[in-house]
Amino acid sequence: KKVVLGKKGDTVELTCNASQKKNTQFHWKNSNQIKILGIQGLFLTKGPSKLSDRADSRKSLWDQGCFSMIIKNLKIEDSDTYICEVENKKEEVELLVFGLTANSDTHLLEGQSLTLTLESPPGSSPSVKCRSPGGKNIQGGRTISVPQLERQDSGTWTCTVSQDQKTVEFKIDIVVLAFQKASSTVYKKEGEQVEFSFPLAFTLEKLTGSGELWWQAERASSSKSWITFDLKNKEVSVKRVTQDPKLQMGKKLPLHLTLPQALPQYAGSGNLTLALEAKTGKLHQEVNLVVMRATQFQENLTCEVWGPTSPKLTLSLKLENKGATVSKQAKAVWVLNPEAGMWQCLLSDSGQVLLESNIKVVPTW
């Protein structure tokens, strides 16, 4: 007998062909021999089955000897063996209807788990294989679990259900609610304006929630809130801002913060958390601020950086157009009795300059 796989909510066509390409009598019945539909004269008649209001046939193909049955809005309980009686012969078709749904909302926070549940007819033993938009393959039986969703899991998941060498494909759209970046570092010279941006990795028609930037300055013994805000239909309103530093916040998305000037006492790392309406849990983005200061005091030229720097970063002081250079994998470098000229302080990572500050040393007579 032929096996046909169907998807819950979809439409399926069960085919039945007569040997002669002409209009003839036919009937479709279920396994309990209850008539579903058939032909009487030139008219389609329906029997007392539960399918009667969802079953149909292509009348236009009857004179070609094709007596298919179309079942709309498939239900799991439509799974059955259907019998087509035509020209004194019986054709059996086994229909297996499957459903695949996400156990919760398909808009999930990064780090939350996704569970896909397969609805299947009794007696079936299907296998499921899902492929994430990022190419991750996950296999399972009745349930498939993704324990910790990542940004790259956002998009259309393609799941294939297999039974009796037949397959049916499901597509499920998953939106992972996250910031575009988990972490970012801003490098600034002392006194420069600092811009922090927190773009989201998703778009929602209505975006409402609240948030906070919590900051741990390198020089401070404890962390504190720098700003709290509300978000109503993508409009940002500041709730409370600390007096020092006095941050400014953009009124529209993406979330955007401005620190009037970079100062050593502000260097450190922060965590922006965003709580979205009707979601338990929060989105997080780490942000780091590294501040550079170059100073000359008496016979000492010093360059310092504050904030979270990796030990492999190099800090150097170099005299422009001269070979004189002092380099260290440290947070401060200095030159005693520096030559007159324009000195450059450079913070670099494997030769790539992250931050530079120039300071002019005037000759002392």
Epitope: G209, E212, A220, R240, T242, E277
Partner: antibody, heavy 119, light 107 residues
Framework: EVQLVESGGGLVQPGGSLRLSCAAS????????MSWVRQAPGQGLEWVAN????????YHVDSVKGRLTISRDNAKNSLYLQMNSLRGVDTAVYFC????????????WGQGALVTVSS | DIQMTQSPSSVSASVGDRVSITCRAS??????LAWYQQKPGKAPKLLIY???GLQSGVPSRFSGSGSGTDFTLTISSLQPEDFATYYC?????????FGQGTKVEIK
Amino acid sequence: EVQLVESGGGLVQPGGSLRLSCAASGFTFSSYWMSWVRQAPGQGLEWVANINEDGNEKYHVDSVKGRLTISRDNAKNSLYLQMNSLRGVDTAVYFCAREGGQWLALDYWGQGALVTVSS
Amino acid sequence: DIQMTQSPSSVSASVGDRVSITCRASQGISSWLAWYQQKPGKAPKLLIYGASGLQSGVPSRFSGSGSGTDFTLTISSLQPEDFATYYCQQANSFPWTFGQGTKVEIK
């Protein structure tokens, strides 16, 4: 270690005045909003007032407006609650608390000062 | 003013039990909600901030959830030191308001 110590509580007649103080230590007092919260005997907590870092922004619950006033002196690391025209319903333990927690939570509390308004 | 309603007002439980306390705000407060524990004669202690954030030093058996108007504090396995009164508090708009409290008693 963060510490908040209230003082100035006691017995006062209806219509009388009292000034509660809260001495802060173990943190940069001038960097935090501060609150007063009270608790009547056997009752729940009631937020009374709060004040911003430099003292020029203040909020009070309607039931105490014009009678209880929050203030601070950053040079002395102190928070105050000036209580005038006191009534029986003001009888409570008054706690000072730091608004230093994430999401505006009150992360440190003093041990409380009992104010009894009775004739 | 935003009214905060806690339920139940008291709960009798045994050590090891799972206890849930709910708090409902009279209007949406996003995640501006904190939970406090208070023992007799002591000051309240912050447990949860921002509806679901666990305050540093608080045991992980305490958890918070919810957003908008409905919030829950859950103690996954009640310990002897957890018998106390618990309060929710909104920091969405002034005046800040507390729930009436939920007393967790020994059964």
